[in-house]
């Protein structure tokens, strides 16, 4: 999904006529079209600030099949996504939630949960340590031909 | 070594069930996601739902609700589907998939071919 | 749902030469489409991720491109190998769906 912008809610208001850009600016909630601050469509785009050279509202982000909507989409803030239940975003893969680890391995112990922005996290038993990484047994791989397995994904 | 291992073809009546199996070896099924994938004879691929098997949250495609159970055994790292009512239309190969993450298919079993004939 | 459209159903190509296998969204999946391949008699294989991602142990002459809904598989120069079927999905969003597949035979 894109960047969610978290602005606060605004009222969208009324079509209001300018004469110039330099006037003022639409409010959030509008964008400018032939010298007019028109609003943008609930549920379809929106314009999170107030501005005076947007010529199109901000199409609404649409939550992806790994995701859960927190909030819909309104005329001044984009929809919040989150990721399901039982999975993370990636700092390097943001656009992407991956499965949470339900273990931690031999030696070391669980000291964080999974939550929608990170993996359990897992400090070894004497040191104290993070661990950071996969647990090998759940490496990404792909088959050469059923049943067998190749080397693991990028 | 991670693999798939799918019970063998069945041969089942029209209107009866079946429950197909897919024991995994290599990884813990509680840390991916297990899909269940249709091919029926000379056809393409149909995606039938997904669990997880951490919380048992399913996901089905709407033709396949009611037609297909997703169920998992954590202790045994063994994944289930059942099919009921079935039809001479539910013949097919049904593979059970893994992914570490939901959006697509990074391993499959080798598949268990079900023939409903009377 | 989201319907995939994959042409030609089948490509007749000699070994060696450019495969170019292309595969429609009937709406924007942004780049949440993956590609695998599928011999006679085994489970399909996953070739690319995420429209354009490689795959470690799939050689690179498979490459994958395209974004929001219109995508395309090149194999850069077929090898005996390479003749099978080939499925496009797409993951954006419930359920996910397949396109009807592409054969690819040699000429």
């Known amino acids: 999904i894109t960047q969610q912008d978290l602005a606060p809610q605004q009222r969208a208001a009324p079509q209001q006529k300018r004469s110039s850009p330099s006037e003022g600016p639409c409010l959030a909630g509008q964008y400018l079209s032939e010298g007019n601050c028109k609003p943008c469509r609930e549920g379809i785009d929106y314009t999170s600030h107030s501005n005076h050279s947007l010529d199109s509202c901000i199409l609404c982000t649409r939550c992806d099949s790994g995701e859960v909507e927190l909030s819909p989409c309104t005329t001044t803030r984009n929809t919040v996504c989150q990721c399901e239940e039982g999975t993370f975003r990636e700092e390097d893969s943001p656009e992407m939630c991956r499965k949470c680890r339900t273990g931690c391995p031999r030696g070391m112990v669980k000291v964080g949960d999974c939550t929608p922005w990170s993996d359990i996290e897992c400090v070894h038993k004497e040191s104290g340590t993070k661990h950071s990484g996969e647990v090998p047994a759940v490496e990404e791989t792909v088959t050469s031909s059923p049943g067998t397995p190749a080397s693991p994904c990028s | 070594e991670v693999q798939l291992q799918q019970s063998g073809a069945e041969v089942v009546k029209p209107g009866a069930s079946v429950k197909l199996s897919c024991k995994a070896s290599g990884f813990n099924i509680k840390d991916t996601f297990i899909h269940w994938v249709k091919q029926a004879p000379g056809q393409g691929l149909e995606w039938i739902g997904r669990i997880d098997p951490a919380n048992g949250n399913t996901k089905y495609d709407p033709k396949f609700q009611g037609k297909a159970t997703i169920t998992t055994d954590t202790s045994s790292n063994t994944a289930y589907m059942e099919l009921s009512s079935l039809r001479s239309e539910d013949t097919a190969v049904y593979y059970c998939v893994r992914g570490l993450y939901t959006y697509y298919f990074d391993y499959w079993g080798q598949g268990t071919l079900v023939t409903v004939s009377s | 749902e989201i319907v995939m459209t994959q042409s030609p159903a089948t490509l007749s190509v000699s070994p060696g030469e450019r495969a170019t296998l292309s595969c429609r969204a009937s709406q924007s999946i942004s780049n949440n489409l993956h590609w695998y391949q599928q011999k006679p008699g085994q489970a399909p294989r996953l070739l690319i991720k995420?429209?354009?991602q490689s795959i470690t142990g799939i050689p690179a002459r498979f490459s994958g491109s395209g974004s929001g809904t219109e995508f395309t598989l090149t194999i850069s120069s077929l090898q005996s190998e390479d003749f099978a079927v080939y499925y496009c999905q797409q993951g954006n969003s419930w359920p996910y769906t397949f396109g009807q597949g592409t054969k690819l035979e040699i000429k």
């Open positions: 995420f429209a354009s």
